[in-house]
């Protein structure tokens, strides 16, 4: 029986009975918050073989092993993960071993086993046999291995029953509990699963099988399950579902949800039955099961009950995330905030249409309205008193409306009003009149020419760059010396620069009046010699990276015909030179025969240019005689390998647990002080633990149903 869509067992251990007939849990399995220690020995679910998402265990008192509960759990697919993890065992106070002795495959995701004070048999499991990559596993804060004394079956009687593998250079027996070995398939099977008798399964099987080379005898499927058979792909007229099986159209149309209406049911897209159309797609009509590509961002209509939505904080803006059409009026009143421009863009940047009016007042934190980067239509179906549909009042730092060279905005009905925006040039307002089609609608008092732009350099001259030179991490630029009418009015220049992968940045990107700015700024004093052109060396840059640069002249706020003169350059895009790439990552080598090595690696994290080829070098090394000096069959600890200088026996040093061999010292000494990097790593580790714990608590603690 397939159970789902996710099972949450909490508070009462008797809820476990819900698992009685499950062979596959389609979704997650949570077992958590059972505070009263119970006897779980009578609970056994041998039918359960597969969990398609993840398994989460948290604070279950009295549970000592999972082996009795789930003796045949073979595969956790990790189709959806819990914070990147497919198996989470957290704060299980009485758990002594994991004991999932039939667990053979975690298809996706890592494991997190943390804060289980009594949990042993962790170092005896070779997770690399179960997961593709073990580097993201997080096994911390459990019972210290020294206190565990983990012994695999038969070790005490010197008749070891389990097989050995190497983990962290330690070759040892692999087992789940004191009487259960970790199953390994013969090397002849390669990546294939095997039966209990070590016969290789069909390639489409995953985890295990009841008969060899038979695609109908699999415990779980590598790809998809359909009509009793494991198949590499779903047959015609069937669709992938939940990452593991094939279903027909009727099945997909008959999946219900308490949250959505029946005309918002599951859809079929790209051969898959899924909950909703993927990003960039929309339903082909209100009662359709199929998706079509959106033209531009997919429409999402948002409506404000009270007609007017006040945006006075990031929190209130958050409610508009993803909205493309806003039915109602927007009142923007942002007096302060941290990183406000980019936060507002994140949450309001997709709005294309506002059906009512837009009012921006007392928004002293705003420098630009470019956070409304997709706004193209204000319908003005509802207007402010005086028939205004765009109203901008008392915004002390507002300098730019939008970048009118790249913006089409139409105001279908209603007038515009601008007053007391001291840094907003009137020319910017007039430009908006032309673009939006409102020219001629405004009366004389609607755009105040005296108190808009009174404290801004509204008549800007253009600064021209004269030369640019680049190296791998430096840019040198010079520009024409600016000569205002009175030379004494020129104070200095400010150079603004930032990384710009695309040539689409504007001066006001990410900038607000509270200190946030995505541009780096450097002040450049005037050269004392009036004939020398000003310039700057920008250093500490990244190789092979495109930067945007512009320069502004800093002038006295000298009023001339009620306006301040200023100067700035166009934005210049310039790329630094290529450099040597960083080292290739995750180099792995393995031998697949007596005369071959297979070497794999990932590209460098910093290519610093266009990578064209890799150089692989190798050399033969002499066999190390050290390998023969220790009896590897003894159960004694293998000595730590150190190329000693001949004065101290390594084994003696390692016998004293309180000391470490440190630096080039000739004897026991104190532990070396932690480096800054180590301290930083510890700090990040602690932070990461907190983030996960918060995520866990936020995910599982829910209000009790009324």
């Amino acid at each position: 029986e397939i159970c789902g869509p996710g099972i949450d067992i909490r508070n009462d251990y008797q809820q476990l009975k819900r698992l009685e007939n499950c062979t596959v849990i389609e979704g997650y399995l949570h077992i958590l918050l059972i505070s009263k220690a119970e006897d779980y020995r009578s609970y056994r679910f041998p039918k359960l073989t597969v969990i398609t998402e993840y398994l989460l265990l948290f604070r279950v008192a009295g549970l000592e092993s999972l082996g009795d509960l789930f003796p045949n759990l073979t595969v956790i697919r990790g189709w959806k993960l819990f914070y990147n993890y497919a198996l989470v065992i957290f704060e299980m106070t009485n758990l002594k071993d994991i004991g999932l002795y039939n667990l053979r495959n975690i298809t996706r995701g890592a494991i997190r086993i943390e804060k289980n004070a009594d949990l042993c048999y962790l170092s005896t499991v070779d997770w690399s046999l179960i997961l593709d990559a073990v580097s993201n596993n997080y096994i911390v804060g459990n019972k210290p291995p020294k206190e565990c004394g983990d012994l695999c079956p038969g070790t005490m009687e010197e008749k070891p029953m389990c097989e050995k593998t190497t983990i962290n250079n330690e070759y040892n027996y692999r087992c789940w509990t004191t009487n259960r070995c970790q199953k390994m398939c013969p090397s002849t099977c390669g990546k294939r699963a095997c039966t209990e008798n070590n016969e290789c399964c069909h390639p489409e099987c995953l985890g295990s099988c009841s008969a060899p080379d038979n695609d109908t005898a699999c415990v779980a499927c590598r790809h998809y399950y359909y009509a009793g058979v494991c198949v590499p792909a779903c047959p015609p007229n069937t669709y992938r579902f939940e990452g593991w099986r094939c279903v027909d159209r009727d099945f997909c149309a008959n999946i219900l949800s308490a949250e959505s209406s029946d005309s918002e049911g599951f859809v079929i897209h790209d051969g898959e039955c899924m909950q909703e159309c993927p990003s960039g797609f929309i339903r082909n009509g209100s009662q359709s099961m199929y998706c079509i590509p959106c033209e531009g961002p997919c429409p999402k209509v948002c409506e404000e009950e009270k007609k007017t939505k006040t945006i006075d904080s990031v929190t209130s803006a958050q409610m508009l995330q993803g909205c493309t059409i806003f039915k109602g009026n927007l009142l923007i009143n942002i007096r302060r905030g941290n990183n406000i421009a980019s936060e507002l863009e994140n949450f309001m940047g997709l709005i294309e249409v506002v059906t009512g009016y837009v009012k921006i007042r007392h928004s002293h934190a705003l420098v630009s309205l470019s956070f409304l980067k997709n706004l193209r239509l204000i319908l003005g179906e509802e207007q402010l008193e005086g028939n205004y549909s765009f109203y901008v009042l008392d915004n002390q730092n507002l300098q730019q409306l939008w970048d009118w060279d790249h913006r089409n905005l139409t105001i279908k009905a209603g007038k515009m009003y601008f007053a007391f925006n001291p840094k907003l040039c009137v020319s910017e307002i007039y430009r908006m009149e032309e673009v939006t089609g409102t020219k001629g609608r405004q009366s004389k008092g609607d755009i105040n020419t005296r108190n808009n732009g009174e404290r801004a350099s509204c008549e800007s001259d253009v600064l021209h760059f004269t030369s640019t030179t680049t190296s791998k991490n430096r840019i040198i630029i010079t520009w024409h010396r600016y000569r205002p009418p009175d030379y004494r009015d020129l104070i200095s220049f400010t150079v603004y620069y930032k990384e710009a992968p695309f040539k689409n940045v504007t001066e006001y990107d990410g900038q607000d009046a509270c200190g946030s700015n995505s541009w780096n700024m450097v002040d450049v004093d005037l050269p004392p010699n009036k004939d020398v052109e000003p310039g700057i060396l920008l250093h500490g840059l990244k190789p092979w990276t495109q930067y945007a640069v512009y320069v502004k002249a800093v002038t006295l706020t000298m009023v001339e015909n009620d306006h301040i003169r200023g100067a700035k350059s166009e934005i210049l895009y310039i790329r630094t030179n290529a450099s040597v790439p960083s080292i290739p990552l995750d180099v792995l080598s393995a031998s697949n025969s007596s005369s071959q090595l297979i070497v794999k690696w990932n590209p460098p994290s910093l290519p610093n240019g266009n990578l064209s080829y890799y150089i692989v070098r190798w050399q033969r090394q002499p066999q190390d005689g050290y390998l023969y000096r220790h009896n590897y069959c003894s159960k004694d600890k293998i000595p730590i390998r150190k190329y000693a200088d001949g004065t101290i026996d390594i084994e003696e040093v390692t016998e004293n647990p309180k000391t470490e061999v440190c630096g080039g010292e000739k004897g026991p000494c104190c532990a070396c002080p932690k480096t800054e990097a180590e301290k930083q790593a510890e700090k990040e580790e602690a932070e990461y633990r907190k983030v996960f714990e918060n995520f866990l608590h936020n995910s599982i603690f829910v209000p009790r149903p009324e």
């Epitope: 159970c3 099945f251 008959n254 219900l256 029946d262 005309s263 209100s286 009662q287």
Partner: antibody, heavy 118, light 107 residues
């Protein structure tokens, strides 16, 4: 022919239990959500429960915690386990395959009578 | 839950006349409304699905209209076999709900 045949009704005392069955034929049972609807004597129709193709279950508030809907796709059968029965549960119970926007053909069982009385 | 209110409770009409039945939802349900006919001792029979979609085998004198919260079932010329109880049913959101029914009787 698409058909739903019901069984399991009868007389039961208050507080007692009863299990209704509904055998489906003529369509791919596992591919459809299945519902239970009841009708008290002389009253209107009342929707009580559904189980979808994934096995997700939903209930009307009036039966939540007392009734359990389940299905056995291998046997093409739908079940309604009714516990803690009350006098007000007396009704004709119908199993139904109610359509959705894509597949609108509604199919109903013949109905089975449940009488809760001491 | 979504409440469906049918009106009138009883409709007295002569054969051959037109009958108009109304169903109002307590909140918008799009077009996820269906109409059933039920005769004594029988299971309900679907007449109209999704507000206005007709079904094969159902006489074309039955038609449905409406969306959102207000819906109408119209029987253009009543035949003797049309005298029965009519129910509306919403499938927009769980739990599904039925209207209380409209009895169409011979005048």
């Amino acid at each position: 022919e698409v058909q739903l045949v019901q069984s399991g009704g009868g007389l039961v005392k208050p507080g007692g239990s009863l299990r209704l069955s509904c055998a489906a034929s003529g369509f791919t049972f596992s591919s459809f959500a299945m519902h239970w609807v009841r009708q008290a004597p002389g009253k209107g129709l009342e929707w009580i429960s559904v189980i979808d193709t994934r096995g997700a279950t939903y209930y009307a508030d009036s039966v939540k915690g007392r009734f359990t809907i389940s299905r056995d796709n291998a046997k093409n059968s739908l079940y309604l386990q009714m516990n803690s029965l009350r006098a007000e549960d007396t009704a004709v119970y119908y199993c139904a395959r109610l359509g959705n926007f894509y597949y609108g053909m509604h199919v109903w069982g013949q109905g089975t009578t449940v009488t809760v009385s001491s | 839950e979504i409440v469906l209110t049918q009106s009138p409770g009883t409709l007295s009409v002569s054969p051959g006349e037109r009958a108009t039945l109304s169903c109002r939802a307590s909140q918008s349900i799009g077009s996820s409304l269906h109409w059933y006919q039920q005769k004594p001792g029988q299971a309900p029979r679907l007449l109209i699905k999704y507000a206005s979609q007709s079904l094969s085998g159902i006489p074309d004198r039955f038609s449905g209209s409406g969306s959102g919260t207000d819906f109408t079932l119209t029987i253009s010329r009543l035949e003797p076999e049309d005298f029965a109880v009519y129910y509306c049913h919403q499938s927009s959101r769980l739990p599904h709900t039925f209207g209380q029914g409209t009895k169409v009787e011979i005048k």
